[in-house]
Amino acid sequence: ELCDDDPPEIPHATFKAMAYKEGTMLNCECKRGFRRIKSGSLYMLCTGNSSHSSWDNQCQCTSSATRNTTKQVTPQPEEQKERKTTEMQSPMQPVDQASLPGHCREPPPWENEATERIYHFVVGQMVYYQCVQGYRALHRGPAESVCKMTHGKTRWTQPQLICTGEMETSQFPGEEKPQASPEGRPESETSCLVTTTDFQIQTEMAATMETSIFTTEYQ
C-alpha cells in the first residue's frame, strides 16, 4: 500500500532511506534540457520474491532539443549484492535495512537523471533525517520517520528532530547545551559551513529491529 503523503518536512533538514520496501516507485526524472524517451518507463518499481528484490523498468533520458539516441547506463546487478571490504561502517549508522528481505538497494544512476530523486514510498518504509549544512540537531528522540497504516489510512510518524541555526540558543528542558561552534547559515552552492553534530541517527531499541544499531558492521 502506497503512503498517501510524503515524509514530514522538517525545517532545515533532509531525509534519506537506506533501502526501499517492495512496492516503492522511483520517478524517471530527467535534468533540465532532457526528457524521458518516448515509450520509456515513467517509473522504476521495487519488486521481488521471498529471497530477492530488484528494480523493474529502466529510466532513460534524451535531449529535449535533438533527436539523438540516448546513452543507456549499463546495469550493474553485482552491486545490488552484499560487498565485503576492509572499510568499517560507522557505528552510528542506522540498521542495515538493505540486508532485510523485501527491500531493494539504491537504484543505479542513469544518464542525465535529475539530481533529486522522487520516491513514492509504501507502508513500513523508514526514512532518516539529518540537519543541513550550517544547522545543528536538537534531539528529543529518534530522527526517523516510518510510514504506518492506522484505521485504514497511512501516516508518517513525526521525527523528533529540530534543526537550529548556530546563533540560536533555545534548548529543550533537560537538554544538554550543544557544544560551542562557529555561526552558520544554510548550505548554498557557493558556501558551506561546518555541521557541528556528527552523523547522529538515533533509533528506538524497542522497534522491530532485532540487532543493535551500535554494533560495528563490516560491508
Epitope: K16, T115, V132, T197
Partner: nanobody, 125 residues
Framework: QVQLVESGGGLVQAGDSLRLSCAAS????????MGWFRQAPGKEREFVAT????????YYADSVRGRFTISKDNAKNTLFLQMSSLRPDDTGVYYC??????????????????WGQGTQVTVSS
C-alpha cells in the same frame, strides 16, 4: 569550510595498483554520497566511480569496472579509490567530489557541489 584533500597519486607502471584517499572535513561526511572523477590531458573531466551515503552501494564507469573499487569510511571521514590493473589510459588528475545535499549519487558534475584540488596519477607503459 568544506575541504576535500586527495592523496595517494603517483607514477606507476601499467598493471600496478594505487590507492587514492580523500580526507573530508567541514561537512557531515556520513550523510553524503561521494564520487571520483578524472581528467586526462586535453580532455574533459569524466566520471569514474560513486558511492551512496551509507557506503553500501556503488557505481562505476564502464572503463574501470572490475578494476577499481570505491569505498568510504564514515567513521574516519575518508573516501577511497582502490585502483588495480592500471593502464596508460588511466593517466590523469583524479578528483574527489561531494554530492549535493539532496543528490543520491555523485554521478554527474551537476550532482556535486564541492571538489578537491586533485591528485596526479601517471601510468607508464
Amino acid at each position: 569550510q568544506v575541504q576535500l584533500v586527495e592523496s595517494g597519486g603517483g607514477l606507476v607502471q601499467a598493471g600496478d595498483s594505487l590507492r587514492l584517499s580523500c580526507a573530508a572535513s567541514g561537512f557531515n561526511f556520513g550523510w553524503h554520497a561521494m564520487g571520483w572523477f578524472r581528467q586526462a590531458p586535453g580532455k574533459e573531466r569524466e566520471f569514474v566511480a560513486t558511492i551512496t551515503w551509507t557506503g553500501r552501494d556503488t557505481y562505476y564507469a564502464d572503463s574501470v569496472r572490475g578494476r577499481f573499487t570505491i569505498s568510504k569510511d564514515n567513521a574516519k571521514n575518508t573516501l577511497f579509490l582502490q585502483m588495480s590493473s592500471l593502464r596508460p589510459d588511466d593517466t590523469g588528475v583524479y578528483y574527489c567530489a561531494k554530492a549535493r545535499e539532496r543528490a543520491t549519487w555523485a554521478y554527474s558534475e551537476d550532482d556535486c557541489d564541492y571538489w578537491g584540488q586533485g591528485t596526479q596519477v601517471t601510468v607508464s607503459s
